[in-house]
Interface confidence: medium
């Protein structure tokens, strides 16, 4: 599901991005995870794929192509073409779930021809099939007939899966391992900085022990934690100073309207 990229570099255009961070270069950060992400390329005026290392980086990074387009392409939501209600479903909507062979752990959606609904599944990151969407909306728009969709989506919960660090496996095939649920994070209304600064500290999946810092949005401070070397989330900084510089600025003292991505 990767977006086509231009083969040639075009000159930096006059189109003004919606947010200043959309003009930032893609930054994979110093960590070594392999997270397929998207950034807005100021030169091509397109959202393009890059591989994010899992920590630090900058705000020009999105989990989905759709999110990138909505955030950085002016007028994108107005011009996005909705599928006609009576349109035929493409053949790939009927393909069975395919996690692909790679070792990523990506939340994706597929159309389930049995339930006639879009459902969540875990994608490994490469070599799956085209019944694989980055957002529920995209899946519904392309594969679900809008006439039948007032009923709630039957989502597969992420806790039905575990990871051994290499591949995603059904819980029933692994002895007594259950993924712990992440604690709830503070609501966004009190914080208008980078969204990953709201994530809880996550030590990751590997066995190293590296000293890292995470931003605690409840205390407004950066605290130390041990990082295992892979996985985890973006609230992960090599120094306290970097952590504060990245996250402290988002704390709002007086409430004001508007949400900053």
């Amino acid at each position: 599901l990767s977006e086509e990229a231009d083969d040639t570099d075009s000159e930096l255009g006059s189109m003004k991005p919606l947010h200043t961070f959309c003009a930032m270069k893609a930054d994979d950060g110093p960590c070594k995870a392999m997270i397929r992400s998207y950034f807005f390329n100021m030169y091509t005026h397109q959202c393009e794929e890059f591989i994010y290392g899992g920590c630090e980086g900058n705000e020009n990074r999105f989990d989905t192509l759709e999110e990138c387009k909505k955030t950085c392409i002016p007028g994108y939501e107005k011009t996005a073409v909705k599928a006609a209600s009576g349109a035929e479903r493409p053949d790939f909507c009927f393909l069975e779930e395919d996690p692909g062979l790679c070792r990523g752990y990506m939340k994706r959606y597929l159309y389930n021809n049995q339930t006639k609904q879009c459902e969540r599944f875990v994608y490994g990151g490469c070599l799956g099939n085209r019944n694989n969407f980055e957002t529920l909306d995209e899946c519904k728009k392309i594969c679900e007939n809008p006439v039948h969709s007032p009923s709630p989506v039957n989502e597969v919960q992420m806790s039905d899966y575990v990871t051994d660090g290499n591949t995603v496996t059904d819980r029933s095939t692994v002895n007594n391992i259950v993924v712990p649920q992440s604690p709830k994070v503070p609501r966004r209304r009190d914080y208008r900085g980078r969204p990953w600064c709201l994530q809880p500290a996550d030590s990751g999946l590997c066995k190293a022990s590296e000293r890292r810092f995470y931003y605690n949005s409840a205390t407004g401070k950066c605290h130390r934690f041990n990082y295992t070397g892979c996985g985890g989330n973006n609230n992960n900084f090599t120094t306290r100073r970097r952590c504060l510089r990245s996250c402290k600025t988002g704390l709002i003292k007086n409430k004001s309207k508007g949400v900053v991505k």
Epitope: P99, L101, C102, R103, G125, L127, D164, T167, T169, D170
Partner: antibody, heavy 124, light 108 residues
Framework: QVQLQQSGPGLVKPSQTLSLTCAIS??????????WGWIRQSPGRGLEWLGM?????????SYAVSVKSRITINPDTSKNQFSLQLNSVTPEDTAVYYC??????????????WGQGTLVTVSS | DIVLTQSPATLSLSPGERATLSCRAS???????LAWYQQKPGQAPRLLIY???TRATGVPARFNGSGSGTDFTLTISSLEPEDFAVYYC?????????FGQGTKVEIK
């Protein structure tokens, strides 16, 4: 050390079925971090990926569109091997056929172990 | 399908020289899904580089891969006699897996 040993006939008549087997040693066909596939090579076409199977709590397969209607790749867990069947062959299917393991490594996937290759000629 | 175009088709060099092989993809394939193989006559291809830049086990340090997105390069810093062969790039980003048409590195 992982090795793949191919076996099967080198001559197949047009309209018949090409059948090859790839025996795995040093790894399991049901491995959770590998895929097992077939590639062919002919002077006219270069290297052409035909398809693969892999196990991730159940079996999955992917096939090239060019052969999708004629190909089957099956695992045989009892013998730790996998096979290729290509139906209704024509002289165009004449090529060297390779089996290979695709590993999903930390840096990305790659076909790190290959069989010795079998030259299959389709001719009456 | 993602088309991979390799250039040049043939590279004529002497032992000790540096070889630079190019592979261009018709679509963005990121940086983790490009591999390079070496093939000698009568042999199966051998994996040299995966993830665009990671050397496979046992591959000498003179082989280096780089690039991301659509443009990738395989560099052999100083050619040894055993390096004269055909080199293929391959994308494993999406089905179908595809290969480039190959670059033959021959002795000048």
């Amino acid at each position: 050390q992982v090795q793949l040993q191919q076996s099967g006939p080198g001559l197949v008549k047009p309209s018949q079925t090409l059948s090859l087997t790839c025996a795995i040693s040093g790894d399991s066909v049901s491995s959770n971090s590998a895929a097992w596939g077939w590639i062919r090579q002919s002077p006219g076409r270069g290297l052409e990926w035909l398809g693969m199977i892999y196990y991730r709590s159940k079996w999955y397969n992917s096939y090239a569109v060019s052969v999708k209607s004629r190909i089957t790749i099956n695992p045989d867990t009892s013998k730790n091997q996998f096979s290729l069947q290509l139906n209704s062959v024509t002289p165009e299917d004449t090529a060297v056929y390779y089996c290979a393991r695709t590993m999903s490594k930390y840096g990305g996937p790659g076909m790190d172990v290959w069989g010795q290759g079998t030259l299959v000629t389709v001719s009456s | 399908d993602i088309v991979l175009t390799q250039s040049p088709a043939t590279l004529s060099l002497s032992p000790g020289e540096r070889a630079t092989l190019s592979c261009r993809a018709s679509q963005n394939i990121g940086s983790n899904y490009l591999a390079w193989y070496q093939q000698k006559p009568g042999q199966a291809p051998r994996l040299l580089i995966y993830g665009a830049s990671t050397r496979a086990t046992g591959v000498p340090a003179r082989f280096n891969g780089s690039g991301s997105g659509t443009d990738f390069t395989l560099t052999i810093s100083s050619l040894e006699p055993e390096d004269f062969a055909v080199y293929y790039c391959q994308q494993l980003n999406s089905i179908p897996v595809t290969f480039g048409q190959g670059t033959k590195v021959e002795i000048k």
